[in-house]
């Protein structure tokens, strides 16, 4: 909706300026549990190796970041909360900060494009469903247009 | 594995040259069912509007193309095959051509990056699982590294 569009645009306008604050909030939240977990980590080898940083900076950056946020929120933190009653609230707070960051990244589409759906595709699917049987004929009859669009996409990728 | 890497690199090296052939194969396959479906399509308005082409060319291009290929393969073509026994094999052949194109696009990662998984993330998850309870401490103790990586990703996005 136009309202959402405006909200999204506003998010993008102010987002770079908010970045240091959001990262500071994350670091502050982590500082409350840092000692607890780092004291218990006796292993010298890194889990988050530099190859992960390279993926974050490469063409798979969005997927890598999206997957890692999901990994921390769904796998790591729920288990981390149960390690000690004293740190449960702090881990929970850290998770909330991470969720807030993801929400802001999603709102400003260019930051997490891989988590956004194409509106045009949604419109095609909706129109197709409304047309019922006629939709099959229409979609198939326009397959040559689809091929042209694929060609445009691939030509653009080759040029880039 | 190294083998896969080489295959992927070879796909990318030869891919641009193969593009016209793949599109020609798609167009040839479509030509065998084109008349059947276009005769039955009585509607004047387009289903695949230019807004879809714009999405293909924009930052959501990969998702849009990926979703549209899936849409044709999973929703449109299975129903299109059942419209007439005489065209079933031709629609099936068109689907196979589309699957081949998708496979080649996937192999050369830069063409469909949104469908590829980050190897580094996979390695993190595997290492985490192997470490069992120690993995929780390790993943949480390295959350500051994760914040730094997020910062690097976002800084790169702002600069781009």
């Amino acid at each position: 909706s136009p309202g959402q569009g405006t909200q999204s645009e506003n998010s993008c306008t102010h987002f770079p300026g908010n970045l240091p604050n959001m990262l500071r909030d994350l670091r502050d939240a982590f500082s409350r549990v840092k000692t607890f977990f780092q004291m218990k980590d006796q292993l010298d080898n890194l889990l988050l190796k530099e190859s992960l940083l390279e993926d974050f900076k490469g063409y798979l950056g969005c997927q890598a970041l999206s997957e890692m946020i999901q990994f921390y929120l769904e796998e790591v933190m729920p288990q981390a909360e149960n390690q000690d009653p004293d740190i449960k609230a702090h881990v929970n707070s850290l998770g909330e900060n991470l969720k807030t960051l993801r929400l802001r990244l999603r709102r400003c589409h260019r930051f997490l494009p891989c988590e956004n759906k194409s509106k045009a595709v949604e419109q095609v699917k909706n129109a197709f469903n409304k047309l019922q049987e006629k939709g099959i004929y229409k979609a198939m009859s326009e397959f040559d247009i689809f091929i042209n669009y694929i060609e445009a996409y691939m030509t653009m990728k080759i040029r880039n | 594995s190294p083998g896969q890497g080489t295959q992927s690199e070879n796909s990318c090296t030869h891919f641009p040259g193969n593009l016209p052939n793949m599109l020609r194969d798609l167009r040839d396959a479509f030509s065998r069912v084109k008349t059947f479906f276009q005769m039955k399509d009585q509607l004047d308005n387009l289903l695949l509007k230019e807004s879809l082409l714009e999405d293909f060319k924009g930052y959501l291009g990969c998702q849009a193309l990926s979703e549209m290929i899936q849409f044709y393969l999973e929703e449109v073509m299975p129903q299109a095959e059942n419209q007439d026994p005489d065209i079933k094999a031709h629609v099936n052949s068109l689907g196979e051509n589309l699957k081949t194109l998708r496979l080649r696009l996937r192999r050369c990662h830069r063409f469909l990056p949104c469908e590829n998984k980050s190897k580094a993330v996979e390695q993190v998850k595997n290492a985490f699982n192997k470490l069992q309870e120690k993995g929780i401490y390790k993943a949480m103790s390295e959350f500051d590294i994760f914040i730094n990586y997020i910062e690097a990703y976002m800084t790169m996005k702002i600069r781009n």
């Epitope: 982590f30 980590d41 940083l53 | 590294i145 730094n148 690097a152």
Partner: antibody, heavy 117, light 112 residues
């Protein structure tokens, strides 16, 4: 290959300040901490301070009031700022990478600072 | 601050013979996480320091196996089983368990 390169050394007036840089290649300061260590002519090694991967710092008490260590992850560079220099600060200043197991595994070649009028 | 005291100050050795350097800390250097962060560095003439041993007894990658570390609590030792010409230089012990981190005064190894 891991490499650390210090720069910014030279002649400084007593009472002046210095800003040294430590540029890295082969690894990222987003993942590892960096230490500063100095060596006065003919003397031993003296630990000055560290900037951890998360950006927090620890300093030797002897230098706390006039030493600041900072970093720019995007440039993969760490900085050492020292104020109120005196002749005793004449030394070769080294930066060293913090390995994951709490030790300094790779060192730069050092940059020489002379405090003299 | 934790004071690290090395002995001897100078160690003249014969090529092919063993050498031993002692390092004593003014207090226990077991970190609160249970690890003992005691390292040994070698500094050849005109070069930067080079890590030899970390966490008391672990040899760093590329370090010859003639170098070994041992000890616990406050007393630590670096041993060279057979001294070679390239081993000439100053050796420093270092503790990274308690801030501020501190070096020993150094032991100069020279060939007799």
């Amino acid at each position: 290959e891991v490499q650390l390169v210090e720069s910014g050394g030279g002649l400084v007036q007593p009472g002046g300040s210095l800003r040294l840089s430590c540029a890295a290649s082969g690894f990222s300061f987003a993942t590892y901490g960096v230490h500063w260590v100095r060596q006065s002519p003919g003397k031993g090694l003296e630990w000055l301070g560290v900037i951890w991967r998360g950006g927090s710092t620890d300093y030797s008490a002897a230098f706390m009031s006039r030493l600041t260590i900072s970093k720019d992850n995007s440039k993969n560079t760490v900085y050492l700022q020292m104020n109120s220099l005196r002749a005793e600060d004449t030394a070769v200043y080294f930066c060293a990478k913090q390995a994951y197991g709490h030790y300094m595994d790779y060192w730069g070649q050092g940059t020489s600072v002379t405090v003299s009028s | 601050d934790v004071l690290m005291t090395q002995s001897p100050l100078s160690l003249p050795v014969t090529l092919g013979q063993p050498a031993s350097i002692s390092c004593r800390s003014s207090q226990n250097i077991v970190h609160s996480n249970g690890n003992t962060y005691l390292e040994w560095f070698q500094q050849r003439p005109g070069q930067s320091p080079r890590l030899l041993i970390y966490k008391v007894s672990n040899r760093f990658s590329g370090v010859p196996d003639r170098f070994s570390g041992s000890g616990s609590g406050t007393d630590f030792t670096l041993k060279i089983s057979r001294v070679e010409a390239e081993d000439v230089g100053v050796y420093y012990c270092f503790q990274g368990s308690h801030v501020p981190w501190t070096f020993g005064g150094g032991t100069k190894v020279e060939i007799k």
